[in-house]
């Protein structure tokens, strides 16, 4: 069983991956940002089913993709570089799904543009959190 | 820069084994499902095998099943398949693909396996 | 197992022209899983459509993807003389996949 401890580190790790993800949307959302139309574009592997901490291999999995939509912003909106972003939020995601050893990924029927993709994880993440509260 | 390397194809005897390998540079290796895809001479693709990023759950053709197996060993960045029993319609180009989603963003340039006596 | 049907079996066109590509499903397919690649002789296949209508990285904007269901298509609006090859849908969830037959690109 959980410990009180791990419980509240778990929440922390959420709490710091939330932050994150809202700050590439608002990044992104910016009225400024002139790339945003070319950057919605881009489609991203939605998850089928995202309830439990494992389902953030889904996230996983898309990060380098999100670098790489990130890398067209070029947005002085966003306090670390696409590179450093996506790799703080690796961290967090690698110590959050733990080893789970046996899940594969499955995918919603959509892909999903980089607004519905950073909105869906921050919904998972908002979730995940009230349960540990 | 995303790389895949295959190796160990090569001529066998019908009911032979072999060992394929592919290794992987570019990208965060333990991350990513990967697959093996084969192609016949002048034949089309058809998928072999696929192993989650953990390497825990495995997956396999109808074709190869019992026969086959994938793994891999994520502090080599490497995927296997190993053939054993192998037959005559085995003969292909073996390739590793990375998986984005459903779909293979990847591919090595493949090694070719041919059985025969 | 879902099969997937490519048509044609070859395409015989100019370079300029403007090349349509079909994939019927047996069954129906998520549009989040079909995807296209192309491949020229002595290569590995290349990514070119993900999400049935999604241009994979460096894919020029003459290749495009459609459909849903059972029917989707790859349209190529202009050939270009680098664009003759052979032609792959794709589709599955995850773990298990399965191709079309192919469909080749001829110059005519």
């Known amino acids: 069983a959980p410990t009180s401890s791990s419980t509240k580190k778990t929440q922390l790790q959420l709490e710091h991956l939330l932050l994150d993800l809202q700050m590439i949307l608002n990044g992104i959302n910016n009225y400024k940002n002139p790339k945003l139309t070319r950057m919605l574009t881009f489609k991203f592997y939605m998850p089928k089913k995202a309830t439990e901490l494992k389902h953030l291999q889904c996230l996983e999995e898309e990060l380098k993709p999100l670098e790489e939509v990130l890398n067209l912003a070029q947005s002085k909106n966003f306090h670390l570089r696409p590179r450093d972003l996506i790799s703080n939020i690796n961290v967090i995601v690698l110590e959050l799904k733990g080893s789970e050893t046996t899940f594969m990924c499955e995918y919603a029927d959509e892909t999903a543009t980089i607004v519905e993709f950073l909105n869906r994880w921050i919904t998972f993440c908002q979730s995940i959190i009230s349960t540990l509260t | 820069e995303v790389q895949l390397l295959e190796s160990g194809g090569g001529l066998v005897q019908p009911g032979g084994s072999l060992r394929l390998s592919c290794a992987a540079s570019?990208?965060?290796?333990?991350?990513?499902?990967m697959s093996w895809v084969r192609q016949a001479p002048g034949k089309g693709l058809e998928w072999v095998s696929a192993i989650n990023g953990s390497g825990g759950s495995t997956y396999y053709a109808d074709s190869v099943k019992g026969r086959f197996t994938i793994s891999r060993d994520n502090s080599k960045n490497t995927l296997y398949l190993q053939m054993n029993s192998l037959r005559a319609e085995d003969t292909a180009v073996y390739y590793c693909a990375k998986r984005r989603g459903p779909s293979f963003d990847y591919w090595g340039q493949g090694t070719l396996v041919t059985v025969s006596s | 197992e879902i099969v997937l049907t490519q048509s044609p079996g070859t395409l015989s066109l100019s370079p300029g022209e403007r090349a349509t590509l079909s994939c019927r499903a047996s069954?129906?397919?998520?549009?989040?899983?079909l995807a296209w690649y192309q491949q020229k002789p002595g290569q590995a296949p290349r990514l070119l459509i993900y999400?049935?209508?999604s241009r994979a990285t460096g894919i020029p904007d003459r290749f495009s993807g459609s459909g849903s269901g059972t029917d989707f298509t790859l349209t190529i609006s202009r050939l270009e003389p680098e664009d003759f090859a052979v032609y792959y849908c794709q589709q599955g969830p995850g773990g298990p996949a399965t191709f079309g037959q192919g469909t080749k690109v001829e110059i005519k």
């Open positions: 999400g049935a209508s």
């Open positions: 069954q129906s397919v998520s549009s989040s899983y």
């Open positions: 570019g990208f965060t290796f333990s991350s990513y499902a």
